[in-house]
Amino acid sequence: MKVLQEPTCVSDYMSISTCEWKMNGPTNCSTELRLLYQLVFLLSEAHTCIPENNGGAGCVCHLLMDDVVSADNYTLDLWAGQQLLWKGSFKPSEHVKPRAPGNLTVHTNVSDTLLLTWSNPYPPDNYLYNHLTYAVNIWSENDPADFRIYNVTYLEPSLRIAASTLKSGISYRARVRAWAQCYNTTWSEWSPSTKWHNSYREPFEQH
C-alpha cells in the first residue's frame, strides 16, 4: 500500500481543515488508514482522523482544530496499521479556503432595485470576518449566455443592482462566494443559489 498523491490540506481558518490524498489502488480509507495530526506546541495532543473515501483510491479527512492563529503548524502522519506511509506538516494560515457565505436573499420590494444580502460565514472575533470580499454570480435559467459576475470589494455583505440591468419577466438565480486577500486564500465554495422572478416596470418612452 502506497500513497500516490500526498495529502494536501486547506483550512477554513476557524475550526476545520480538510485533507485529501490518493492511494495507489482502491482503498477502504476508513478501515485501512488513519491520519494523526498534532499542533506543534508543548503538551498538545495527537488527534486521530478516520478518513472517508473520496472516489476509488481517494481519501478525505476533516481535521478539527482550535481557533487558528497564523503561527499554528501541525504535523501529519498517515498510518496503515503500524506502518507509517507518509509524514508531513501543514500550516493552516498558508492554505486558507474560506467558508462559503450563507443566507443569500434577494429583496425585490425596493423599487426598480435588486438588493442581494448574505451572511458573513465568520464570527466577529475571527480574523477573516473583516477581511472577506465577495463575488456574486447571477445567471438566467432560460439563457445560458446571460451569466454575470459582480465583484464586491467592500466589507458589507450586500449588493445593489438596478433591476433593469437584467431582463424582465424571466427567472434568475444568484450565488455568492468569498475570498480574503490578506492570506491570499483560494475562493470559497459557492453558497447555495437562490431564485427569483425578475419583473420591473419598463419606463414610458418619450415621443
Epitope: 475550526s15 495532543e45 495527537a46 482522523c49 482544530m65 482550535d66 496499521g81
Partner: antibody, heavy 129, light 108 residues
Framework: EVQLVESGGGLVQPGGSLRLSCAAS?????????MCWVRQAPGKCLEWIGC?????????YYASWAKGRFTISRDNSKNTVYLQMNSLRAEDTAVYYC????????????????????WGQGTLVTVSS | DIQMTQSPSSLSASVGDRVTITCQAS??????LAWYQQKPGKAPKLLIY???TLAYGVPSRFSGSGSGTDFTLTISSLQPEDFATYYC???????????FGCGTKVTV
C-alpha cells in the same frame, strides 16, 4: 502554565449530591479536545466517568455505569468544566480527577475521546453518614 | 464494554532490570492504547499513547508495542524513579468505552 485544578470535593451523606469543578488555565477549555473526569477509589483501579467535547458541538460521552447519576457540563466563559453527581453512595468515595483528552474523529460530527494527556491534582469525595 | 486485563498485578525488580508489563483487550482496539505511571498521592502521568508513541518528556527507556488485543510496556533499564504503579488504558469507540487495566505495582 498549562494546568487543571479540581475543587468541590468533601464529605457528603449517602443519597446526597455534589458538584465538582475543573478550572483550566494556560489554554482555552473551548478548543478542540475533550475534557474528562476519571476517578480512583482508595486502593482501586482508575475508572473513566465521562467526557465533554470542548469545541462548539459540546457532545458528551459517559461510561455505562455513570449514565443517569453523573452529568458533565461546561462554562466556556469561566474556562471551567463541571461534574454533577447525584444519589451518591459509599462506593462513590474516591479521588476525582479532571483530565484533558485527545480524540478520534470521523468527519466533523463524530468525535470520540481517546487518551488523557493532562491531569489535575484530584479532589477527594467521601460519601459517608 | 471492553475489558482490559493487565498482568502481572505486581512485580519486584532491581535498578537496571528490564521490566515488561502486558495488557490484553477483550476485543480489537486497533492502536488505541495508552500507558500511565502513577506514584502515591499523585495524578497519573501519560507515558505512551497510540500503543507505541512516547509522550513528550518521557525517557526513551520506556517503550510500547502491540496492536489489536495484545500490548506491552517495556522499561529497558529500571531507574529508582520508576518504582510506581503502571496502568494501561484501552479505548473502544465501537463499544463506547475507555477502560483502564487494574494496574501493575513495580516495587524494589
Amino acid at each position: 502554565e498549562v494546568q487543571l485544578v479540581e475543587s468541590g470535593g468533601g464529605l457528603v451523606q449517602p443519597g446526597g449530591s455534589l458538584r465538582l469543578s475543573c478550572a483550566a488555565s494556560g489554554f482555552s477549555s473551548s478548543s478542540a479536545h475533550y475534557m474528562c473526569w476519571v476517578r480512583q477509589a482508595p486502593g482501586k483501579c482508575l475508572e473513566w466517568i465521562g467526557c465533554i467535547y470542548a469545541g462548539s458541538r459540546g457532545s458528551t460521552y459517559y461510561a455505562s455505569w455513570a449514565k443517569g447519576r453523573f452529568t458533565i457540563s461546561r462554562d466556556n466563559s469561566k474556562n471551567t468544566v463541571y461534574l454533577q453527581m447525584n444519589s451518591l453512595r459509599a462506593e462513590d468515595t474516591a479521588v476525582y480527577y479532571c483530565a484533558r483528552a485527545a480524540f478520534v474523529n470521523r468527519g466533523v460530527s463524530w468525535i470520540w475521546p481517546y487518551y488523557f494527556s493532562l491531569w489535575g491534582q484530584g479532589t477527594l469525595v467521601t460519601v459517608s453518614s | 464494554d471492553i475489558q482490559m486485563t493487565q498482568s502481572p498485578s505486581s512485580l519486584s525488580a532491581s535498578v537496571g532490570d528490564r521490566v515488561t508489563i502486558t495488557c490484553q483487550a477483550s476485543e480489537d482496539i486497533e492502536s488505541y492504547l495508552a500507558w500511565y505511571q502513577q506514584k502515591p498521592g499523585k495524578a497519573p502521568k501519560l507515558l505512551i499513547y497510540r500503543a507505541s508513541t512516547l509522550a513528550y518528556g518521557v525517557p526513551s527507556r520506556f517503550s510500547g508495542s502491540g496492536s489489536g488485543t495484545d500490548f506491552t510496556l517495556t522499561i529497558s533499564s529500571l531507574q529508582p524513579e520508576d518504582f510506581a504503579t503502571y496502568y494501561c488504558l484501552g479505548s473502544s469507540y465501537s463499544t463506547g468505552s475507555n477502560i483502564f487495566g487494574c494496574g501493575t505495582k513495580v516495587t524494589v
